[in-house]
Amino acid sequence: EDWQCPRTPYAASRDFDVKYVVPSFSAGGLVQAMVTYEGDRNESAVFVAIRNRLHVLGPDLKSVQSLATGPAGDPGCQTCAACGPGPHGPPGDTDTKVLVLDPALPALVSCGSSLQGRCFLHDLEPQGTAVHLAAPACLFSAHHNRPDDCPDCVASPLGTRVTVVEQGQASYFYVASSLDAAVAASFSPRSVSIRRLKADASGFAPGFVALSVLPKHLVSYSIEYVHSFHTGAFVYFLTVQPASVTDDPSALHTRLARLSATEPELGDYRELVLDCRFAPKRRRRGAPEGGQPYPVLRVAHSAPVGAQLATELSIAEGQEVLFGVFVTGKDGGPGVGPNSVVCAFPIDLLDTLIDEGVERCCESPVHPGLRRGLDFFQSPSFCPNPPGLEALSPNTSCRHFPLLVSSSFSRVDLFNGLLGPVQVTALYVTRLDNVTVAHMGTMDGRILQVELVRSLNYLLYVSNFSLGDSGQPVQRDVSRLGDHLLFASGDQVFQVPIQGPGCRHFLTCGRCLRAWHFMGCGWCGNMCGQQKECPGSWQQDHCPPKLTEFHPHSGPLRGSTRLTLCGSNFYLHPSGLVPEGTHQVTVGQSPCRPLPKDSSKLRPVPRKDFVEEFECELEPLGTQAVGPTNVSLTVTNMPPGKHFRVDGTSVLRGFSFMEPVLIAVQPLFGPRAGGTCLTLEGQSLSVGTSRAVLVNGTECLLARVSEGQLLCATPPGATVASVPLSLQVGGAQVPGSWTFQYRED
């Protein structure tokens, strides 16, 4: 039977235990918020908030400035002092709930859990390539704010998301806060609001527009705001909330809320349910037809996509897509299928579905039974009526009231379940060349940088490494600064290059030079690295062949052996066709003549495994000595492949030339009819790849082969006679003169 090279798992070409050390900053406490700033004049900064403190870092993550933001009531609290002599409220620690940039000024705005959730504005002062914060301004006017109406109460202790939008000369803060009965009773933050920052930075203009969970639902209906972003003409919030006001509050789903970024009003507030599922290619018995639902959004990010993913999503390159990591429930615990799935929602299609949903509600003829929804924000009503009203009045428009679109937007896991047990806790998507890369942080403190593609049954990793030794979860919010992403884990901030931390996790030259161009990987003799790591020997144009195994491990000194070589970088072409004169194999001093590839034996190799086979016929030279020797493969003048050309030599020890010896044959006679079981004894009888026992020139069918013994069944004899018996190994006769006597049956 043909011997076949053992498959090498694709994973063997990389090592995700390789340690990478990326720049980091120890914040001195659990990182609560982080934001980056890049100015017009090459100045940049990273702002990192922990309990009671705000750090300003330079682009190198070195501390530039530090500001005390609490505890409230403490004389050392620098932000509190900006509000004038106190007391301003109950004393207590300040946990930063909001940290955003107002690009128009530019300024940093921070809002905390203390002092009724008020905010502070810090003008940015460039100093060379670094940035300092000016003295904070307190965004709170005591005479404007009351417990039941507080335009300057922004942050909720339960969590707040803010997106700042410039409209004309004004900055509008799109604010979404989680509420419960206790929070709502204390200086009344709102669920969703749009607030204009006053020009004199004394707070936010009164009379702002807002939506809030109705008091009767506050206890049972809680909305978590996971992410917010601004693209095109809209601001979007992503929420996790109960699927129904009336049913089980633990049955959660994910919604997208859309607000106009051009008009500071909430009449065109729209919500849409996002449905993300894992639909395995082969459905298990009993599995739901549409796939397993993953209703709870954990993290999200929107980004323009590269050409390849755009094609797979049937959209144009550069279009904005919302990516979300979803889990099965709040605890994200394992069910059947992966822990985390990633779904892609093209923004244009989201907008189209919302727009068509609005028209379905508002156009005539009326679609009977269609509800306006959002019963936690407003009185129930049917389309096209406004909330709480039985009919439209002539001076109201159906379109000028909030609406839940009746259809959900459904997508399936981009990774086809391949994230498996990984629990993703952070996500940032970038476009590099024509590739779209998801940079993911995990529950166990790792960073996974993976190409976003649909059509594969394995993950294409840029990298997969541990941020540090703490193993603490990577936090949800990720920021970009130049060509780096900033991830927070525990009390540390880490700076990870978007091109990946390095190339050392690629173990083979082939894998190294097949890496994405943007990674800048090259081969350094025996490792994969970036040019700065090994400037002397670094190259990106060729790989030597790599021998990993061969068969057989021994061959006869006289006679031929069909040698099968295993390894990688033999061909670079799936067909395995070798141009004349490019591959030279020597075993010891003896050449091994390349054999044409038998196309009938070509097997498709799954991309998760890789192995290349090369066959040659070994005919030892007369000068070849018995004993151990090396197998050497040299490849030259190969036409270049897609990523590199093959060029170089690989040597592997462990082949032995042996001389088979035949010592005894028994029995020496048998019936003319044949079928006598002959036993041939000797040494090195199993070497090489072919052997034959000939009785009067006819083959004696081999039943068993071992190093010291051959068993075969004699063929029928023509007459009663003594006939020659010989053993050939590799086509050459083993020395010795033997006869076998055919007798009457």
Epitope: R283, G290, D348, L353, D355, E356, E363, S407, S410
Partner: antibody, heavy 117, light 108 residues
Framework: QVQLVESGGGLVQPGGSLRLSCAAS????????MSWVRQAPGKGLEWVSY????????YYADSVKGRFTISRDNSKNTLYLQMNSLRAEDTAVYYC??????????WGQGTLVTVSS | DIVLTQSPATLSLSPGERATLSCRAS???????LGWYQQKPGQAPRLLIY???NRATGVPARFSGSGSGTDFTLTISSLEPEDFATYYC?????????FGQGTKVEIK
């Protein structure tokens, strides 16, 4: 009420070009995605192309990809189909239709395109 | 591309009878993005069902859609004279969107 009226059909030689228009009225045109569907004489329906409400997303049937271009002018409430390199097999009645997520709920009456030498 | 196969090609029934039309997809039509359309000779098609089972506005209750994944059915509970026409299914989840070849419901 909703109305979709196609125009621009006619006789054209193989390799030639034609531009179909679909004038929409009676609804908020810029809120709806639109499609073109065709029907060869005596044959079934064949979906041709789709465009989203803001024109950012377009889809095409394999049979017309690279030859046909769908577009819209929301200020004029008009949908277009630019057809180049026409072939005999493109001969059909071309319909424009409104909507996507809730099905194509309104259709025009169609315009006949004949490709023949 | 998803191929839709409708059966039977022709259905000969009398008014008042129940009509069951089948549409089978070559691969799963995710989230039931499947519609049914009615077309009479010389007329434009008319939407009957979207999302596999939702009746379009103004469509009589005798029309109902069911199924998911790869097998979908349009049922006309009791045929009226005006229901004799050709019916097409359409998948609109994966571009390119595709129609079935049609089922003609004719008077027996």
């Amino acid at each position: 009420q909703v109305q979709l009226v196609e125009s621009g059909g006619g006789l054209v030689q193989p390799g030639g070009s034609l531009r179909l228009s679909c004038a929409a009225s009676g609804f908020t045109f810029n809120s709806y995605s639109m499609s073109w569907v065709r029907q060869a004489p005596g044959k079934g329906l064949e979906w041709v192309s789709y465009i989203s409400s803001r024109s950012s997303t377009t889809y095409y049937a394999d049979s017309v990809k690279g030859r046909f271009t769908i577009s819209r002018d929301n200020s004029k409430n008009t949908l277009y189909l630019q057809m180049n390199s026409l072939r005999a097999e493109d001969t059909a009645v071309y319909y424009c239709a409104r909507g996507y997520f809730h099905g194509m709920d309104y259709w025009g009456q169609g315009t006949l395109v004949t490709v023949s030498s | 591309d998803i191929v839709l196969t409708q059966s039977p090609a022709t259905l000969s029934l009398s008014p008042g009878e129940r009509a069951t039309l089948s549409c089978r997809a070559s691969q799963s039509v995710s989230f039931d993005y499947l519609g049914w359309y009615q077309q009479k000779p010389g007329q434009a098609p008319r939407l009957l069902i979207y999302g596999a089972s939702n009746r379009a506005t103004g469509v009589p209750a005798r029309f109902s859609g069911s199924g998911s994944g790869t097998d979908f059915t349009l049922t006309i509970s009791s045929l009226e004279p005006e229901d004799f026409a050709t019916y097409y299914c359409l998948q609109y989840f994966n571009p390119p969107h595709t129609f079935g070849q049609g089922t003609k419901v004719e008077i027996k």
